[in-house]
Amino acid sequence: HNTTVFQGVEGQSLQVSCPYDSMKHWGRRKAWCRQLGEKGPCQRVVSTHNLWLLSFLRRRNGSTAITDDTLGGTLTITLRNLQPHDAGFYQCQSLHGSEADTLRKVLVEVLADPLDHRDAGDLWVPGESESFEDAHVEHSISRSLLEGEIPFPPTS
């Protein structure tokens, strides 16, 4: 699998999409996990509804939400109030029993907000009561890493 880069702006929402063959993964729940190290395990962040027929319902874990269009074959993950610590490698997965198929490998990059000149202490963090439905979702910038490309070029 190639890695697809999704870039979002700090403090805003980032939408990650993972297309898949809807028939190949028919009846399969999906998950979004964070890769722990290059060869480490992928730690589950959030998964779709326990009942596959209800996969279209949004499920959330903290600031991350997931929804699955099982007919169209698109898994969508929304990372709300994007923070620098959200940057890293992730996977979209299709689940069956104890097994997980990788649908897409994702690198999330968090960009500083060019319009935000406030101190970090003044950053607005939304309250738990605010729903994902109200969240403003920016269109994410995505591209695939080229063969052999270093995801985080060394800084001088």
Epitope: K24, G27, L51, L53, S98, E99
Partner: antibody, heavy 121, light 107 residues
């Protein structure tokens, strides 16, 4: 009628190559995984591997990895099981089966009639 | 890989009697378990999938109980066409694995 029809019995010598086939009809062949199962004479069933003809994604059971090759040609709705160098221990009945996925679980619901492969010098 | 065991290896039953076949997994397979019937010279036939769902055309005399590691296939009243080999298959973990089978023969 939904069915899988396998190629006929084969008699081969050790070291020879062989490809047997499994043709699907009556359903969308590209949308279902096809599995291969071995049954040695007088023995039980052994899972060999599986292929998704839509994109040729193939998975092998560790016991059969490197021993056989599973492939498919979706244009003619046919899956294949291939050996590059047969051994006497490959003598068995080989079945292909369709895997249907669903919300209540997966099911090998349609089976081919089997292909008997005999390897003898 | 998960090892499946079936007992007994052979079950001798009279027609009309009840037959109880056991399938045990070396670790939990949740409900990802299927049962197949095979007669000599024929391909296997799907009976049960998802631990307890009967396949199309399978009569109600076939039922399964259990989940996790222990499953039981019950044939409530054996008919002449039920004398055959029965195999369980787990596909919770890769690779999927079959049990060694139980032969149900006429007493």
């Amino acid at each position: 009628e939904v069915q899988l029809v396998q190629s006929g019995a084969e008699v081969k010598k050790p070291g020879e190559s062989l490809m047997i086939s499994c043709k699907g009809s009556g359903y969308s062949f590209t949308n279902y995984w096809i599995g291969w199962v071995r049954q040695m004479p007088g023995k039980g069933l052994e899972w060999m591997g599986i292929i998704y003809p839509g994109d040729s994604d193939t998975r092998y059971s560790p016991s059969f990895q490197g021993q056989v090759t599973i492939s498919a040609d979706k244009s003619i709705s046919t899956a294949y099981l291939q050996w590059s160098s047969l051994k006497a221990s490959d003598t068995a009945m080989y079945f292909c089966a369709r895997r249907r996925q669903g919300i209540w679980g997966d099911a090998l619901d349609i089976w081919g009639q089997g292909t008997l492969v005999t390897v003898s010098s | 890989e998960i090892v499946m065991t079936q007992s007994p290896a052979t079950l001798s039953v009279s027609p009309g009697e009840r037959a109880t076949l056991s399938c045990r997994a070396s670790q939990s397979v949740s409900s990802n378990l299927a049962w197949f019937q095979q007669k000599p010279g024929q391909a296997p036939r799907l009976l049960i999938y998802g631990a307890s769902t009967r396949a199309t055309g399978i009569p109600a005399r076939f039922s399964v109980s259990g989940s996790g590691t222990e499953f039981t296939l019950t044939i409530s009243s054996l008919q002449s066409e039920d004398f055959a080999f029965y195999y369980c298959l787990q596909d919770n973990n890769w690779p999927p694995t079959f049990g060694p089978g139980t032969k149900v023969d006429i007493k």
